[in-house]
Amino acid sequence: DAEQKACPPGKEPYKVDEDLIFYQNWELEACVDGTMLARQMDLVNEIPFTYEQLSIFKHKLDKTYPQGYPESLIQQLGHFFRYVSPEDIHQWNVTSPDTVKTLLKVSKGQKMNAQAIALVACYLRGGGQLDEDMVKALGDIPLSYLCDFSPQDLHSVPSSVMWLVGPQDLDKCSQRHLGLLYQKACSAFQNVSGLEYFEKIKTFLGGASVKDLRALSQHNVSMDIATFKRLQVDSLVGLSVAEVQKLLGPNIVDLKTEEDKSPVRDWLFRQHQKDLDRLGLGLQGGIPNGYLVLDFNVREAFS
C-alpha cells in the first residue's frame, strides 16, 4: 500500500517544485505534506501536474483538513477548485464574496454546476448575501439552483434576483421553496403594473395562495393552461368555476384536454357538476347535483 512506503532519502520536498512532476505516485503519497501544498497552492496550479498527481494532492489536503478546508486555503484554490466535489464544499465555511466570485470564475464553462451551487449555498449558510454580481458570476447555470438552497438560505437571496428567473428554473422546487420565492417575486415586481406584472409573476405562481389567485382573477390576465397546471393543488381547489373562468379567460377551453390530469382533475372533483356544465365544455368529474360535500381532511390525517 502506498501509505506504508517511506519517502526515499533526499526526496522530501520543502516546497512545491517542478521536480514533483517526475515523482512516481507512491513517492508523492509518501513524501508530500498537505500543509506544504496548502501554503503553495499557486504553484500547485502553475506546475503541469497530471490529474492523477493532483488527485494525490487532494487526498493529502483532505487528510490534513478532515473537517473541511480553511477559508485561507479556499481563497487560494484557483484552478484546483475543479478537483473538489460538492460533498467537500458542503463542509466549508466561506464568508468572503470575493472568494466565491473567484472560484465561480474558475468553474465557468467546466461542467461544474454542482460545485458552483454548493459553493454559493455554503456562502449563504454562513450569512452571505447572493447579490446580482454573484448571479452573473454563476453565468449560464440555470437558476434552478435556487431550489437546491435550504429555505433558510433562500431568505438571504435578494428579491432583485427574481428578475432573472425563467419558467423552467422552478420546475423542481418544493412547495415550500415556491412559496418563499413567490413572496420574493411579489416584492421584486411590486412597481410593475398590468400585463407586464402578470408576465413576470406567472413563473412564480406555483407558490401563490388561493387568496392571491382570487385577486389575480380580477385582472383579466388570460392565464395559459401551462401556467394553470403549475398552480399548487391546495390553492387551486379553493377557486370557484367563475373564478377559474375569469383567470383563464378565452383559455378556459384548454381545460378539456387536461380534465383527467392533476391538478385540473383535482379542481374538477371539488366543483359542482352543474357549475361545470354551464361552461359548455363537456367537463366531467364534478360533484353530482344534490350532493353535499363534507371535507374532514380525512385523507390528510392518514397520509
Epitope: 517544485d17 517542478e18 521536480d19 512532476i21 517526475f22 506546475i47 503541469p48 484552478h79
Partner: antibody, heavy 115, light 112 residues
Framework: QVQLVQSGAEVKKPGSSVKVSCKAS????????FSWVRQAPGQGLEWMGG????????NYAQKFQGRVTITADESTSTAYMELSSLRSEDTAVYYC????????WGQGTLVTVSS | DIALTQPASVSGSPGQSITISCTGT?????????VSWYQQHPGKAPKLMIY???KRPSGVSNRFSGSKSGNTASLTISGLQAEDEADYYC???????????FGGGTKLTVLG
C-alpha cells in the same frame, strides 16, 4: 536576476554531433525543469526534451528520441544538449529555457549543418 | 500527438485590440490550465507573456491578457502598439510525453 547564457554558434558536417551548453545564474538550478527548444529558419518552435538537474534523468520528444542527449551539471549550474547524426534539416537556432512555463530563455545558439 | 492550431497571421491598427486563438482538444487545452503564450521578435529569443492561461509574469504589460473557453485559449492585446509586431506562440504541456507542445505561431502585423 536570472540569466541563461548559451555557448556560441557552431558549424557542423552531416553525420557529426554537436553539444550546446546553457549556464544558469541568479536562481535555483537543481529543482527546475530545463527544456531545449529549436527553431529552424523561418519555422516555428519545437520542443526537443528537458531535464530536472536534481534527478539527472531527461525526457525527450519522440521525434528526437535516440538522437538527443540532455544532461546537467549541478556543480556548474549548466545544462547540455547533444544532438548526433546531424543532417542539413537540423540547421536551426537552439534555445534552452527554464521551468515548464519557460519563463527565461537563453539567447539561442545557431547550429549550421553543412557539407 | 497534441496539435495546437493558431491562425497564421493577424493584423490590427495602433490602439485597436486583437485576439489570437489557440485551439486544442479537451484533453490538453480544455482539460488543464497549462497554456502559455510567447512573443518572439525577429532574431530574438521568445519571451513569456502569459502562463497558466491568464497569468502575467511581472514586467509584462497589462495590455496582454489570456483567457480560455472550452478547448480554445486566446491571447488578447489591447491598445495595439508598433512594438507588439512579432510572432506569437501558444504552448501547453503534453502529459503523455512529459513535455511542451507549441502551436504553429501567429504573425502579428501592426498596420500603420
Amino acid at each position: 536576476q536570472v540569466q541563461l547564457v548559451q555557448s556560441g554558434a557552431e558549424v557542423k558536417k552531416p553525420g557529426s554531433s554537436v553539444k550546446v551548453s546553457c549556464k544558469a545564474s541568479g536562481g535555483t538550478f537543481s529543482s527546475y525543469y530545463f527544456s531545449w527548444v529549436r527553431q529552424a529558419p523561418g519555422q516555428g518552435l519545437e520542443w526537443m526534451g528537458g531535464i530536472i538537474p536534481k534527478f539527472g534523468s531527461a525526457n525527450y520528444a519522440q521525434k528526437f528520441q535516440g538522437r538527443v542527449t540532455i544532461t546537467a551539471d549541478e556543480s556548474t549550474s549548466t545544462a547540455y544538449m547533444e544532438l548526433s547524426s546531424l543532417r542539413s534539416e537540423d540547421t536551426a537556432v537552439y534555445y534552452c529555457a527554464r521551468r515548464t512555463s519557460m519563463d527565461y530563455w537563453g539567447q539561442g545558439t545557431l547550429v549550421t549543418v553543412s557539407s | 500527438d497534441i496539435a495546437l492550431t493558431q491562425p497564421a497571421s493577424v493584423s490590427g491598427s495602433p490602439g485597436q485590440s486583437i485576439t489570437i486563438s489557440c485551439t486544442g482538444t479537451s484533453s490538453d487545452v480544455g482539460g488543464y490550465n497549462y497554456v502559455s503564450w510567447y512573443q518572439q521578435h525577429p532574431g530574438k529569443a521568445p519571451k513569456l507573456m502569459i502562463y497558466s492561461v491568464s497569468k502575467r509574469p511581472s514586467g509584462v504589460s497589462n495590455r496582454f491578457s489570456g483567457s480560455k473557453s472550452g478547448n480554445t485559449a486566446s491571447l488578447t492585446i489591447s491598445g495595439l502598439q508598433a512594438e507588439d509586431e512579432a510572432d506569437y506562440y501558444c504552448a501547453t504541456w503534453d502529459h503523455s510525453q512529459m513535455g511542451k507542445v507549441f502551436g504553429g505561431g501567429t504573425k502579428l502585423t501592426v498596420l500603420g
